[in-house]
């Protein structure tokens, strides 16, 4: 019917059981297992009152039957500028959930691709308004993943104040546009995060110690664009002790070659940087100046490309992008489709792998999955994967700790908290803790061997080109060495 | 209730046109993406055509491209698909549907309107 | 273009048992965690109706014995227990992206 709107959780894909806690003690006399979850001691500073706080939200969300039982949801604020809008000429907004006794500020950046001409933009509209108009937004979200507020499933920062702020504006967070004859649509992305940013000072922002901008996808490019002018922003407000960070989830893709090349018609199988090139001029979008002074006008593009844009950065940013990302391979047009694949497919699949682990090896804080997925951080089962024995939620804590101890000049990490995560196995989901499989016909989860054999994936002669037994060769591939 | 009619089908001899309209009530029409899919006899359904909600972009598909013609008038709440050089093809039950803009799901359908091509 | 191929063409189940229709797409058509696969009925002489919207969210009105599942490229429909007024012909379709299409259609028969 009219204006029906399916609010689902993100990623779909069913996850294995939970990984057990990280840190765990036996309750007295029972030989039974408690959960211990780290308070959020950067935010209490000799400050009694927010340190009790945290203690009462703690208490609370370990005590189910609690009157005060905790509210996962966060509250939709529209923009009080109503002149910073979403495609449509709607208000712009975000999603709040306040919390008084932390002084860590996470606000996430909404994926989910971008149209680059009045033509996709006509059909985006139609078909997926909701990332073009706040006008049927409802008026609360749940946080999940890196968003929730209950230790178990953010164990990494469950007691900060989370924002959501939806991608309504299709130009990669990039845009600066406003609406002219010429545009029947706007393109605000950069603008609105500058106005999120500006309204939540009045919110409790101003106090913060830390903002962490995060995203996925589009998102996680959005970061990328604009971590930089977010810091400076502040600095220029008068708030230069706000600590600004990037966390990219999922939004560094690469101008490689397209497995087959495909003219620019639509926005999934256009190849990125055409795609890019053209909507820049589109949406009037904007990249950060110490990038786009390294290439001549016309070749902001590059910009977009984490690999490219990321030397060029003053704040920290911890980059989270699965080695097999299924947006890059659509946009590659190698996307698995279940089909068995021909052997150049999965020449081009492993190499890109490859290539990917190439441009994170100078990223010192990184977690790049052997998996085929696409993102991550706000799944509720974001906790489950690891790379090397570490989780992500494990990882941006050392991340935190390196940056607290005043590490980020050394190259020397901190003892025992890995934070340059990259898997070197070379097959998708190769790594046995990647998100479950599942043949997608019987719904029964398949093991890796399983994966591969079922997408056409010839033992024999891998294990001859490796020089190995394939029994051997399965065997590593079920371990995931 | 929200409803869509098509009307304009007939016998129509090759080489010849045709206009078929779609008149919808009972929402606010100028909020949809329109569509029109066809169904030769005994054959499956086949995607014609798109009209974005402004009117601004038309869509079509190979088969039909450079032969049809799609507008909307906003105002008057109709959908019209002008077919020229008409083909032994092109005989088929033509609907009418909407798409949904929360995933472009075509949730309200017309009762179609049948065209032969035939001399 | 998005091509969907729909299988079987055909298929005869018992009445209460479950009747399973696949289809696959010739590239993903899931995006920022929606996967853009449409499931309709038709029955003879009159217009399809839809079922299931967005892989796997049910239209209202539609009977719980249908449901759907799948992301990425491989998509199901499930229909369970069968009923005799289920006999019908099922269509899949894709919105990802233009231009939109469909599947050849599965004709189920209630033996």
């Known amino acids: 019917g009219e204006g029906r709107k399916t609010w689902r959780r993100r990623g779909q894909q069913p996850a294995p059981a939970p990984l057990p806690p990280q840190r765990t003690e036996a309750a007295p006399g029972t030989g039974q297992p408690v959960e211990s979850f780290p308070l959020d001691f950067t935010a209490v500073e000799g400050n009694m009152d927010s340190f009790m706080a945290q203690v009462k939200s703690l208490a609370q969300s370990l005590y189910p039957c609690s009157a005060q039982q905790l509210n996962e949801d966060l509250r939709l604020h529209l923009l009080l500028n109503t002149s910073v809008t979403c495609n449509d000429g709607s208000p712009a907004g975000y999603y709040l959930k306040e919390s008084k006794g932390s002084r860590r500020w996470l606000l996430f950046l909404e994926g989910g691709w971008y149209c680059f001409s009045r033509e996709n933009c006509d059909s985006r509209y139609d078909t997926m308004r909701r990332l073009m108009s706040s006008k049927d937004w409802p008026q609360t979200r749940t946080g999940t993943g890196i968003l929730s507020s209950q230790p178990e499933e953010n164990p990494y920062w469950w007691n900060a104040n989370m924002v959501f702020i939806p991608y309504c504006s299709s130009d990669v967070w990039s845009g600066a546009s406003s609406k002219s004859e010429k545009n029947e649509y706007v393109f605000m992305g950069a603008l609105i995060i500058r106005e999120v940013v500006q309204e939540l000072l009045g919110r409790g922002l101003s106090g913060a110690k830390v903002l962490l901008l995060a995203g996925s996808s589009a998102g996680g490019t959005g970061v990328l664009l604009n971590v930089d002018r977010v810091a400076e922003q502040l600095e220029q407000l008068g708030y230069p002790a706000i600590q600004v960070r990037g966390l990219a989830d999922s939004g560094w893709f690469l101008d490689n070659k397209q497995y087959r090349r495909t003219d620019c018609v639509d926005t999934v199988t256009c190849a990125p940087t055409e795609a890019i090139r053209r909507g820049i001029r589109y949406w009037n979008g904007m990249v950060p100046e110490r990038c786009r002074s390294q290439f001549k006008e016309g070749e902001e593009w590059n910009c977009f490309l984490g690999y490219k844009v990321y030397p060029t950065l003053r704040c920290p940013v911890f980059v989270v992008q699965w080695l097999f990302d299924e947006a890059q391979l659509t946009a590659d047009n190698a996307h698995l489709t279940g089909q068995p694949v021909q052997e150049g497919q999965w020449l081009y699949i492993q190499n890109l792998g490859h290539e990917l682990r190439n441009t994170l090896k100078d990223v010192p804080a990184s977690f790049a999955p052997a998996c085929l997925s696409h993102e991550i951080i706000i799944r509720s089962h974001w906790t489950d994967v690891q790379v090397k024995g570490t989780s992500l939620p494990r990882a941006l804590h050392c991340w935190d700790r390196s940056l607290h101890d005043s590490h980020k000049a050394s190259k020397t990490p901190l003892k025992g908290c890995p934070i340059h995560l990259v898997d070197s196995c070379p097959w998708p989901h190769c790594n046995p803790s990647c998100p479950t499989i599942r043949d997608q016909f019987t719904g029964q989860e398949m093991n890796v061997a399983q994966f591969l054999m079922h997408m056409g994936f010839d033992v024999q002669t891998v294990a001859q080109q490796q020089g190995l037994e394939p029994s051997k060769l399965l065997g590593m591939l079920s371990s995931g060495s | 209730d929200v409803q869509l009619l098509e009307s304009g089908g007939g016998l129509v001899q090759p080489g010849g046109s045709r206009k078929l309209s779609c008149a919808a009530s009972g929402f606010t029409f100028s909020d949809f993406g329109m569509h029109w899919v066809r169904q030769a006899p005994e054959k499956g359904l086949e995607w014609v055509a798109y009209?974005?909600?402004?009117?601004?972009?038309?869509y079509y598909a190979d088969t039909v491209k450079g032969r049809l013609t799609l507008s909307r008038d906003n105002s008057k709440n109709t959908l019209f698909l002008e077919m020229t050089s008409l083909r032994s093809e092109d005989t088929a039950m033509y609907y009418c549907a909407r798409a949904s803009y929360d995933g472009g799901y075509f949730d309200c359908w017309g009762q179609g309107t049948s065209l032969t091509v035939s001399s | 273009d998005i091509v969907l191929t729909q299988s079987p063409a055909s298929l005869a189940v018992s009445l209460g048992q479950r009747a399973t229709i696949s289809c696959r797409a010739s590239?993903?058509?899931?995006?920022?965690?929606?996967?853009?696969i449409h499931w309709y009925q038709q029955k003879p002489g009159q217009p399809p109706k839809l079922l299931i919207y967005?892989?796997?969210d049910l239209e209202s009105g539609v009977p719980a014995r249908f449901s759907g599942s799948g992301s990425g490229a491989a998509f199901t429909l499930n229909i369970h227990p069968v009923e005799e007024e289920d006999a019908a012909t099922y269509y899949c379709h894709h919105s990802r992206e233009l231009p939109f299409t469909f599947g050849s259609g599965t004709k189920l028969e209630i033996k």
């Open positions: 009209s974005s909600s402004g009117g601004t972009t038309v």
């Open positions: 590239k993903s058509v899931s995006t920022s965690g929606y996967s853009y």
């Open positions: 967005l892989a796997s």
